[in-house]
């Protein structure tokens, strides 16, 4: 089966690589704009020059294109605790990035919050705080892991998962409680 | 102690508009940055949008952008979901939260309140 190409894809594949169809007339092929342009004019006829502009402050293009606007730069989301890793160049978006010690967390393909890596007190560091992953902790005995904290077993209550961990823990406690009733 | 309670909710027709509304107490509502998810029928949780702490920025899902408006009023503690243009697709049961600060989890979410879009 022939892929789909939609109607852009299809008029760009009839010229070589790096030029595009001329929308009012598909027997000629301009020249792509190089990345940090855009497209103010096709070219008026075969081997003549398109009219690309620069991208103004605040917008870019960061490949070879026939884009009539450039694209709005990102903007990093101070409210997610993101920070500027690089600012948005003519020829390429804004990077934002997390603080060190922090990691990302994606609540969605574009989306993403900065969370303190954990410090894993009362257990040890399995794998260390990576840049999209929070550190993977091993709890010592008597703890077990809640939101990624090593929590005393003396919080885990029966019908919490930590039954299996705290086992021990939570028979004595049992143990004590039957010896006190009577 | 946190409290989140969402209205507004019901059954609608493809095309349909509907607001709901997320009434909070128990904390300063201005201090914080506030969130809509939802959840579909046998799906996980989508964050839908997000508003600062005034109001100023807002952040859309694609899967919403251009038909769900987030607002909030911090002298009602009340934060709002206007939604238009409803689709099959948009039935979810919808919660307000607190912006997550410790971790990826909800400290703080409300019971929610069922959309169905249907026709």
């Known amino acids: 089966l022939v892929p789909h190409l939609g109607d852009r894809e299809k008029r760009d594949s009839v010229c070589p690589q790096g030029k595009y169809i001329h929308p009012q007339n598909n027997s000629i092929c301009c020249t792509k704009c190089h990345k940090g342009t855009y497209l103010y004019n096709d070219c008026p006829g075969p081997g003549q020059d398109t009219d690309c502009r620069e991208c103004e402050s605040g917008s870019f293009t960061a490949s070879e294109n026939h884009l009539r606007h450039c694209l709005s730069c990102s903007k990093c989301r101070k409210e997610m605790g993101q920070v500027e890793i690089s600012s948005c160049t003519v020829d390429r978006d804004t990077v934002c990035g997390c603080r060190k010690n922090q990691y990302r967390h994606y609540w969605s393909e574009n989306l993403f919050q900065c969370f303190n890596c954990s410090l894993c007190l009362n257990g040890t560091v399995h794998l260390s705080c990576q840049e999209k992953q929070n550190t993977v902790c091993t709890c010592h005995a008597g703890f077990f892991l809640r939101e990624n904290e090593c929590v005393s077993c003396s919080n885990c209550k029966k019908s919490l998962e930590c039954t299996k961990l705290c086992l021990p823990q939570i028979e004595n406690v049992k143990g004590t409680e039957d010896s006190g009733t009577t | 102690e946190v409290q989140l309670l969402e209205s507004g909710g019901g059954l609608i027709q493809p095309g349909g508009s509907l607001r709901l509304s997320c009434a909070a107490s128990?904390?300063?509502?201005?201090?914080?940055?506030m969130v809509w998810v939802r959840q579909a029928p046998g799906k996980g949780l989508e964050w839908v949008s997000h508003i600062d702490r005034v109001g100023q920025d807002t952040y859309y899902a694609d899967s919403v952008k251009g038909r769900f408006t987030i607002s909030r009023d911090n002298s009602k503690n009340t934060l709002y979901l206007q939604m238009n243009s409803l689709r099959a697709e948009d039935t979810a049961v919808y919660y307000c939260?607190?912006?997550?600060?410790?971790?990826?989890?909800?400290?703080?979410r409300g019971q929610g309140t069922l959309v169905t879009v249907s026709g």
């Open positions: 128990g904390f300063t509502f201005g201090n914080e940055v």
């Open positions: 939260a607190l912006l997550p600060k410790r971790g990826p989890w909800f400290d703080y």
